[in-house]
Interface confidence: medium
């Protein structure tokens, strides 16, 4: 959460001299309340915009717009505090619009905009516009808040932003997962144009539950340049899990631009369809059946015979 670096922050408009200042998010009117305070903003509109930084990076920014109510309280409006709170970290960033001249009624409703809050993909923010001065302790609130969820890097508009491209958004692995038999899953995906390794996490779940009953990790070494953009396939050996039939395959790349934090792609294989007249279910459900002829201990990442190869 930061401000767009190079822009001169402007809030003046015809009929109003205004300057934008950094704010500590604690306006002086909290400490020294005023008797007469303006009413709250009428409407807040928030949408996503993409702007370029002085280094030429494309970054997602919040475009915040609000209007004033048409009441006499605008005579006491000295400015506004804009606050953006990132909900998962409680990080807050504020700026202050400081009006250097008195507002007067004119033929159009007063409207203000600000488009300099740089945000992160797939994060939720609370945007608050507080009219200044803030109300006395028991006074009517004169702010409005709205939540805004920034789309993730799958979103077409976000895909081309620098933070998304850095995390591998341009790679589309086009994963396919196929059940070969009760003990094998075949995973196919397209390699990216970088000599970096991949990790496949297989997580299995009972039919209607969300706690995992089995996990296995498979490592894929870095492909050679001639294998870039080619399909790679991996056969994973299951532990023949009984009642543990829904399999989620997640592929994690380790691109140089994002290392451990690259975007992961998933595909899921559902449990087989239940027959119309199901057999009576016992009052317990073992998670897997005996394996034949294998003495290799298979748990977590030790899945025995998983193997892979790349092909054109």
């Amino acid at each position: 959460l930061r401000l767009l670096d190079h822009r001169a922050l402007v809030c003046s408009q015809p009929g109003l001299n205004c300057t934008v200042k950094n704010s500590t998010c604690l306006d002086d009117s909290w400490i020294h309340p005023r008797n007469l305070t303006p009413s709250s903003p009428k409407n807040i509109y928030i949408n996503l915009s993409v702007s370029s930084t002085q280094h030429g990076e494309l970054v997602p920014v919040l475009h915040v717009e609000w209007t004033l109510q048409t009441d006499a309280s605008i005579l006491y409006l000295e400015g506004a505090e804009l606050s953006v709170l990132q909900l998962n970290t409680n990080e807050r960033l504020c700026v202050r619009f400081e009006f250097l001249s008195k507002l007067r009624h004119h033929h159009r409703r007063w409207r203000f905009t600000f488009s300099h809050f740089v945000v992160d993909p797939d994060q939720e923010y609370e945007v608050t516009v507080h009219h200044l001065p803030k109300p006395i302790p028991d006074g009517d609130p004169n702010h409005q808040s709205k939540n805004f969820l920034v789309p993730d890097c799958e979103h077409a508009r976000m895909k081309v932003t620098t933070p998304c491209m850095s995390s591998g958004s341009l790679w589309d692995p086009n994963i396919t997962v196929e059940t070969l038999d009760t003990q094998h899953l075949r995973v196919d995906f397209t390699l990216w144009n970088e000599s970096t390794h991949y990790q496949i996490l297989l997580t299995s779940f009972p039919h209607m539950e969300n706690h995992s009953c089995f996990e296995h990790m498979h490592h894929i070494p870095a492909p050679r340049p001639e294998e870039f953009h080619q399909r790679s396939n991996v056969t994973l050996t299951l532990r023949n899990l009984k009642g543990c039939c829904r399999h989620q395959v997640q592929i994690q790349p380790f691109f140089s631009s994002c290392l451990n934090d690259c975007l992961r792609h998933s595909a899921t294989v559902s449990c087989p369809e239940m027959p119309d007249t199901p057999e009576p279910i016992p009052d317990y459900m073992p998670l897997w059946e005996p394996r034949s002829g294998s003495s290799d201990y298979k748990d977590d990442d030790d899945k025995g015979s998983s193997h892979h190869h790349h092909h054109h």
Epitope: T203, H211, S212, P286, L287, D299, D300
Partner: antibody, heavy 116, light 107 residues
């Protein structure tokens, strides 16, 4: 060599919480799950639950559901087990162990005493 | 949950003797069974997994057998360092469960 090193003994009052740590070394932490097992004085072993060090997926024993939380910090290769609303019958040695199903390496154990 | 029952609770034997420990599951656990050895003040030590496979570094005198509901841990010739408590554990079904243990003590 693989090692799981647990935090030191704790004495807690009933109703309090305890958080036991388990620092792993000698292997790639995210490749294996961490399970927690406890043993009351003079008693047998009781499975408490498991956490995937890779995905954070968990599976808890039904009787501890709502009181136990297992977490990992991959940056320090450390697993944590927090038990809340402690009762006197939670007095036990708490072990972390590597893997999800069968436990091939164990921590040295952490004695948690719950007493008023 | 699957209940694991071990017998006997205590076994008094002399060094050099052959020892057979029993573990019974309340329902089939196929071959998803492990054996552990625990000495006082120490963490359990893995001996056997998948009912019959010895863990790394475990001497050949330890062997496991059985599948379904009945399992056996055999120590062919008991050494002085083998006096301990032995636990079986099933991992066929959640929750994972342990037997109550068999204490092998010096006669």
């Amino acid at each position: 060599q693989v090692q799981l090193v647990q935090s030191g003994a704790e004495v807690k009052k009933p109703g309090a919480s305890v958080k036991v740590s388990c620092k792993a070394s000698g292997y790639t932490f995210t490749r294996y799950g961490i399970s927690w097992v406890r043993q009351a004085p003079g008693q047998g072993l009781e499975w408490m639950g498991w956490i995937s060090a890779y995905s954070g997926n968990t599976n808890y024993a039904q009787k501890l559901q709502g009181r136990v939380t297992m977490t990992t910090d991959t940056s320090t290769s450390t697993a944590y087990m927090e038990l809340r609303s402690l009762r006197s019958d939670d007095t036990a040695v708490y072990y972390c162990a590597r893997r999800q199903l069968y436990f091939d390496y164990w921590g040295q154990g952490t004695l948690v005493t719950v007493s008023s | 949950e699957i209940v694991m029952t071990q017998s006997p609770a205590t076994l008094s034997v002399s060094p050099g003797e052959r020892v057979t420990l029993s573990c019974r599951a309340s329902q089939s656990v196929s071959s998803n069974l492990a054996w552990f050895q625990q000495k006082p003040g120490q963490a359990p030590r893995p001996l056997i997994y998948d009912a019959s496979t010895r863990a790394a570094g475990i001497p050949a005198r330890f062997s496991g057998s059985g599948s379904g509901t009945d399992f056996t841990l055999t120590i062919s010739s008991l050494q002085s360092e083998d006096f301990a408590v032995y636990y079986c554990q099933q991992y066929d079904n959640w929750p994972l469960t342990f037997g109550g243990g068999t204490k092998v003590e010096i006669k």
